[in-house]
């Protein structure tokens, strides 16, 4: 789980191990703050929990452009 | 492809406690998400508890909250599902699920199964 | 946590009729944004583990006859046996994965009129 030591700066310590499928994800952001020890992904699911991820993991890159054509296509 | 192995049958007497194993081969355990799921003789099934990825950690059915503590070993690629304070009403057949390597929530791979017969 | 109701408790048709189970969720399990329905449906034979048949409430798992066929929205689900055949007669049941506590359904005994 994401780490808010010195809000509003949230950090990322661990990875989740787990590939979680793209239809359980709500959306997510980046971290890339230098007061962070790492570079991470947190996503956000459809019931609102959050979850640190890799960002050089393939399946978080594809996860991310999923979710970012999501956003972009206008629902029917 | 997974594959899931459980151990063999056992007879407990009231007040013990069981240890059911789920042995996984094609993937490794901390790659997936191990759950338990129980069935009474001819009742339904009954979600017990299991790991889930957004939690991050393991969480149980709240009717066997204190009861039941469920453990992986990943050098050994088991995971493990262990009872205590065993009642007559726990006899049923213990599985062990996991849903594929992406997480969704619904259970792909089942392991055959192992009875649990509770009697004094 | 979410309850899931089947009906009937049990059925009996008759070979090459259509078979109809019902699933009602206590609280929606659809997810607007991506219009996916976290439900799924499973068969059970005697002395078996359940078989996944269909996820996402109407995608058939690959392998499974197009004779079995879900649909639904929402907090109402149907599986469809399209012609009974005898290797059909099981006990299904329907699970939402929308939140924690997973659950199922109570099952629904399929057999042969």
């Known amino acids: 789980q994401p780490d808010a030591i010195n809000a509003p700066v949230t950090c990322c310590y661990n990875f989740t191990n787990r590939k979680i499928s793209v239809q359980r994800l709500a959306s997510y952001r980046r971290i890339t703050s230098s007061k962070c020890p790492k570079e991470a992904v947190i996503f956000k699911t459809i019931v609102a929990k959050e979850i640190c991820a890799d960002p050089k993991q393939k399946w978080v890159q594809d996860s991310m452009d999923h979710l970012d054509k999501q956003t972009q296509t206008p629902k029917t | 492809q997974v594959q899931l192995v459980q151990s063999g049958a056992e007879v407990k007497k009231p007040g013990a406690s069981v240890k059911v194993s789920c042995k996984v081969s094609?993937?490794?355990?901390?790659?997936?998400?191990m759950h338990w799921v129980r069935q009474a003789p001819g009742k339904g099934l009954e979600w017990m508890g299991g790991f889930d990825p957004e939690d991050g950690e393991t969480i149980y059915a709240q009717k066997f909250q204190g009861r039941v503590t469920m453990t992986e070993d990943t050098s050994t690629d088991t995971a493990y599902m262990e009872l205590s304070s065993l009642r007559s009403e726990d006899t049923a057949v213990y599985y062990c699920?996991?849903?594929?390597?992406?997480?969704?929530?619904?259970?792909?791979?089942w392991g055959q199964g192992t009875l649990v017969t509770v009697s004094s | 946590d979410i309850v899931m109701t089947q009906s009937p408790d049990s059925l009996a048709v008759s070979l090459g009729e259509r078979a109809t189970i019902n699933c009602k969720s206590s609280q929606s399990v659809l997810y607007s944004s991506n219009n996916e329905n976290f439900l799924a449906w499973y068969q059970q034979k005697p002395g078996q583990p359940p078989k996944l048949l269909i996820y996402?409430?109407?995608t058939r798992e690959s392998g499974v006859p197009d004779r079995f066929s879900g649909s639904g929205s929402g907090t109402d689900f149907t599986l469809t046996i399209s012609s009974l055949q005898a290797e059909d007669v099981a006990v299904y049941y329907c699970q939402q994965y929308y939140n924690s506590p997973w659950t199922f359904g109570q099952g629904t005994k399929v057999e042969i009129k």
């Open positions: 094609g993937y490794t355990l901390t790659e997936l998400s």
């Open positions: 996402w409430a109407s």
């Open positions: 699920a996991t849903d594929r390597e992406f997480w969704s929530g619904y259970f792909y791979h």
